[in-house]
Interface confidence: low
């Protein structure tokens, strides 16, 4: 057992051009808080997958209001460390996600609103008990500077927090067969309960007599590296040429346990220890029920009709997703017609209509063409709050009073020449091009004739000529 500790040093604009706008303003003061999510191993997991090693949330930082005209500085941070306790062995390799959240303190309906400002992720190797590791991560135009470490909680010690230390019973020496506990020389290593010979650095146990391996190690005593680059010959691992001990594929290789489950070898196969909410041979079945409160944001949980859907979340207005976890951008459905501006007020949607339109969704078109005339046989078209003329051929301008030059827009592609004509325009194409606007090459591959297939390609194979 132990604690992963994260210290945020700064969060602000990164170097280089394109400094981000301050997330806070005089009208909308805000404050930051951070969330860290830890997962064992080096697997590239989705941000939504469980934080199997644990997660923590910081306190909220001081309220910040942008000074008008000033660039976004480093933003004021919450006090203290983020601490993620871990109950089992420290895995040595881990993935992290650190999120910077903004809490808006302005005139929010129903209390403060919060939104994700930046998310950084990484994969690291880290021994417990070591010094603070420093890191800089960038997310878009933002930069996050932080330090982290893993430390064991007494009586655990070691790089994986798996060795146990107890205070000495006698002042001078430890009991028979027990060594002093480095670096705590005044303490003694507790009696070994793991399988005899289990590697103290790469193995650990939770039950007497077992030996479970940290990531990257295998074998009954966790003494065999899963793969060592020095053991790789051009044709793959070969113990004969290099003297390396090459393990056969183990049942836990590639971790068959889904959803953050941990794998342990059994005499015949493997066994998955699943995190809460999952079960099945490979932790592939979600056992979450309404009792686990899976619905966010006030979603109402109802037991599912079949075993594969243990619950269904009925989301309140403004939220969606299987767990009501996504705030609906109701304006993304573009409910305002005719170019109206959509405003999501939380409790309601509003449309701000352009001139010439009215109604809750700007659906009513006020009559723009009344009393308007288009010259030279043009017809008036309503729309956008201002009349528009659709002009007859050869005329243009707002009221169709101007003679149009159909060649002014250079409509002929690839060097074709344009000629005005009573019926519109005509393009005279350059050699090698054809079409009403000279848009088509006569030979699409750019050659005058298709060449023979290059050596090694059979006729009918896909070909690309550069």
């Amino acid at each position: 057992a132990g604690v992963f500790e994260l210290q945020i040093h700064s969060f602000g604009p990164g170097p280089g051009p394109g400094a981000p706008r301050s997330p806070c303003s005089a009208r909308l003061p805000c404050r930051l808080f951070f969330r860290v999510c830890l997962k064992p191993g080096l697997s590239e997991e989705a941000a939504e997958s469980p934080c199997a090693l644990g997660a923590a949330l910081s306190a909220r930082g001081p309220v910040y209001t942008e000074q008008p005209g000033a660039p976004a500085p480093d933003l004021p941070l919450p006090d203290g460390l983020l601490q993620v306790p871990f109950r089992d062995a420290w895995p040595g390799t881990f993935s992290f996600i650190i999120e910077t959240w903004r809490e808006e303190l302005g005139d929010q309906i129903g209390g403060p609103a919060w939104s994700l400002l930046a998310r950084v992720a990484g994969r690291r190797r880290l021994a417990a008990g070591g010094p603070w590791a420093r890191d800089i991560q960038r997310a878009g135009a933002w930069e996050l500077r932080f330090s982290y470490r893993a430390r064991c909680e007494p009586p655990a010690v070691g790089t994986a927090c798996t060795r146990l230390c107890r205070p000495r019973s006698a002042p001078s020496r430890c009991g028979p067969g027990l060594r002093p506990c480095a670096p705590l020389e005044d303490e003694c290593e507790a009696p070994l309960v793991c399988r005899a010979g289990c590697s103290p650095e790469h193995g650990f146990c939770e039950q007497p007599g077992e030996c479970r391996c940290l990531e990257g190690w295998t074998g009954p005593l966790c003494t065999v590296p899963v793969s060592t680059s020095s053991c790789l010959s051009p044709r793959g691992p070969s113990s004969a040429t290099t003297g390396c001990l090459v393990p056969g594929p183990g049942p836990c290789d590639g971790n068959p346990c889904a959803n953050g489950g941990s794998c342990s070898e059994t005499p015949r196969s493997f066994e998955c220890t699943c995190p809460r909410g999952f079960y099945g041979l490979r932790c592939e079945v979600s056992g979450v029920t309404c009792a686990d409160g899976p619905c966010f944001n006030g979603g109402l949980c109802v037991g599912g009709a079949d075993p594969d859907s243990a619950y269904i979340c009925h989301c309140p207005p403004g939220f969606q997703g299987s767990n009501c976890e996504k705030r609906v951008d109701r304006c993304s459905l573009q409910p305002c017609r005719n170019g109206g501006l959509c405003l999501d007020l939380g409790h309601a949607l509003r449309c701000r209509c352009r001139a010439g339109f009215a109604g809750p969704r700007c659906e009513h078109d006020l009559d723009d063409c009344a009393g308007r005339a288009c010259a030279n046989g043009g017809t008036c078209v309503e729309g956008g709050g201002a009349h528009r003329c659709s002009c007859a051929l050869g005329f243009g301008g707002r009221d169709c009073r101007e003679r149009a030059d159909p060649c002014a827009a250079r409509p002929c592609a690839h060097g074709g020449r344009c000629y005005a004509h009573f019926s519109g325009l005509v393009c005279a194409c350059a050699p090698g091009y054809m079409g009403a606007r000279c848009e088509f090459p006569v030979h699409p591959d750019g050659a005058s004739a298709l060449p023979a297939a290059p050596p090694g390609l059979r006729p009918g194979d896909p070909q690309r000529y550069l």
């Epitope: 997660a55 909220r60 309906i109 209390g111 409160g293 309140p316």
Partner: nanobody
Amino acid sequence: QVQLQESGGGLVQAGGSLRLSCAAPGSIFSIASMGWYRQAPGKQRELVAVITSFSSTNYADSVKGRFTISRDNAKNTVYLQMNSLKPEDTGVYYCNARYFERTDWGQGTQVTVSS
């Protein structure tokens, strides 16, 4: 694990009222969806009421019109005002905080409604 501290349970006559309180750490309160669940003897835990960080509320059909959930952001506390209590409201009432993919539970407070 975040500590959620419930209080306010007890023994009450049918038709009476109780007010349950649940205090949560300030670091999560303002962003958590807070809920009350109950578990009657021999039954599954069920949702009673939920209030989101935006203060929108949801209630189980069986308590609509009788129970009211509210939150005091200054005190980091969520309340469940229970009026017109019935014997079937008897059970252990659990406070619940949901934020990100975390779900934290209180220890529970016993509510007994006698007829």
